[in-house]
Interface confidence: medium
């Protein structure tokens, strides 16, 4: 997987009036990294991991950049014509990637009320837009504004591409997010489900990257999908991920079941703990 930096900016309008606040979230390698709150933009590292990446410094630079981006997006929203009454949102997502062969990719995407209407490849400067007439109208509107906005358009978008990559490289230099593998902690628990049945849950946490296989096996063979329930693979705030899988089994049959985990080429098997039911709750 490539290293990536992703900016997600959102601005709002109410009855055609652009609101002063905005929200910016930054993800580094898919992990929540920085956040700029709506009213007062102050870059906030998302957890100890982000602080380690950023080092012992203030985040004035990030705050300045994110505030500037927020202002730009508010101006863009103000230029969208025919805004209807009520609440509307304009979202800009900017992504840059550095691949293992050192090649780079950068793109920018605009969403109005959650619907994608305009994308740009920041390397080729190529714009693309969906086929719907609403999206195309919005896209032309925004593109014209961005072009009018300056003679600086070329340098502006080149700078967006270069700045994103420069920031990504700077963060990667911290060493904290260099290509790494963090194995999961796996924990198996059991809980009462209904008379004669128990729910067994296998949790994996603290792993990186996010790709993981977690499944229940009976007598050494994976159960079919319809007998298992999976949780989403979610960031845990520490630069790593967590997930779970559960299944319902007959009490007394625990010894036949194991949780199978595979991550980054390593795998392990984890039995159901014997003894009393530990947690009195049901996932199903």
């Amino acid at each position: 997987e490539p290293h990536s930096l992703r900016y997600n900016l959102t601005v709002l309008s109410w009855d055609g009036s652009v609101q002063s606040g905005f929200l910016t979230e930054v993800h580094l390698d898919g992990q929540p990294f920085l956040r700029c709150d709506r009213q007062k933009c102050r870059a906030k590292p998302q957890g100890q991991w982000a602080e380690d990446v950023l080092g012992n410094k203030t985040w004035d630079r990030e705050t300045r950049d994110l505030t500037g981006n927020g202002k730009d997006l508010r101006m863009t929203l103000a230029h969208i014509k025919d805004q209807k009454e009520g609440l509307h949102s304009l979202q800009e997502i900017r992504v840059c990637e550095i691949h293992e062969d050192n090649s780079t990719r950068s793109s920018q995407h605009f969403y109005y009320d959650g619907e994608l209407f305009l994308s740009q490849n920041l390397e080729t400067k190529e714009w693309t837009m969906p086929q719907s007439s609403r999206a195309q109208t919005l896209a032309m509107n925004v593109r014209n504004f961005l072009k009018e906005d300056a003679m600086k358009t070329k340098t502006h978008y080149h700078a967006m591409h270069a700045d994103c990559l420069q920031e990504l490289r700077r963060y990667l230099k911290s060493g904290v997010v260099l290509r790494r593998t963090v194995p999961p902690m796996v924990n198996v628990t059991r809980s009462e489900a209904s008379e004669g049945n128990i729910t067994v849950t296998c949790r994996a946490s603290g792993f990186y990257p996010w790709n993981i296989t977690l499944s229940w096996r009976q007598d050494g063979v994976s159960l079919s999908h319809d007998t298992q329930q999976w949780g989403d693979v979610l960031p845990d705030g520490n630069g790593t991920y967590q997930t779970w899988v559960a299944t319902r089994i007959c009490q007394g049959e625990e010894q036949r079941f194991t949780c199978y985990m595979e991550h980054s080429g390593n795998h392990s098997t984890h039995p159901v703990p014997s003894g009393k039911v530990l947690v009195l709750q049901s996932h199903w």
Partner: antibody
Framework: EVQLVQSGAEVKKPGASVKVSCKAS????????IYWVRQAPGQGLEWIGY????????IYNQQFKDRVTITADTSTSTAYLELSSLRSEDTAVYYC???????????WGQGTLVTVSS | EIVLTQSPATLSLSPGERATLSCSAS???????LHWYQQKPGQSPRLLIY???NLASGVPARFSGSGSGTDYTLTISSLEPEDFAVYYC?????????FGQGTKVEIK
């Protein structure tokens, strides 16, 4: 191609022990359990137990628990069945099998005939 | 322990005829855990049908399985010469894993 190759026939005296091997190939040995089943002459199939080679967990049929030991060597992808204090009624063909979906037996070894006779 | 009782013990039929083999469990089992095997003289058993009605790899379509709860059936729609063998049902739902005593399908 999945293959389970068992050791050759054995003739033992009552009270002795026998150890049958089952070498697996064609799949990742630790990813499936190995079952052991026996079949006395002219009789049906009887499940003895199984081993999960990855964690070394062994489940025995209580009927055999006192006299049977199941082991596995992951370095050679081989499972073993040892039966002690042999009696004439232990005369049977002993099969190893790989666990399949929902606790069935999807591949079988060719069988090892163990004859207990004084 | 779940006891599986197969009937009949022996079925004498001619090639081309339909064979119906029954397997009755002493207590209800999930249909996901009922399987059938074929064994010919001097050979190892071979998985025929898994999860009540799914044909194992390489098994001809003339074999089919059905059932639920405590009663399960293996059907061979039109017997071929190579189908004359002993058939076993097996349950994997609870320990110990158990087999039926077998039904021998012989040439009449």
């Amino acid at each position: 191609e999945v293959q389970l190759v068992q050791s050759g026939a054995e003739v033992k005296k009552p009270g002795a022990s026998v150890k049958v091997s089952c070498k697996a190939s064609g799949y990742a040995f630790t990813s499936n359990n190995i079952y052991w089943v026996r079949q006395a002459p002219g009789q049906g199939l009887e499940w003895i137990g199984y081993i999960d080679p990855y964690i070394g967990r062994i489940i025995y049929n209580q009927q055999f628990k006192d006299r049977v030991t199941i082991t596995a060597d992951t370095s050679t992808s081989t499972a073993y069945l040892e039966l002690s204090s042999l009696r004439s009624e232990d005369t049977a063909v002993y099969y190893c099998s790989r666990s399949g979906e929902r606790s069935n037996f999807d591949y079988w070894g060719q069988g090892t005939l163990v004859t207990v006779s004084s | 322990e779940i006891v599986l009782t197969q009937s009949p013990a022996t079925l004498s039929l001619s090639p081309g005829e339909r064979a119906t083999l029954s397997c009755s469990a002493s207590s209800s089992i999930s249909s996901n855990y009922l399987h059938w095997y074929q064994q010919k003289p001097g050979q190892s058993p071979r998985l025929l049908i898994y999860r009540t009605s799914n044909l194992a790899s390489g098994v001809p379509a003339r074999f089919s399985g059905s059932g639920s709860g405590t009663d399960y059936t293996l059907t061979i729609s039109s017997l071929e010469p190579e189908d004359f063998a002993v058939y076993y049902c097996q349950q994997g739902g609870s320990l110990p894993l158990t087999f039926g005593q077998g039904t021998k399908v012989e040439i009449k």
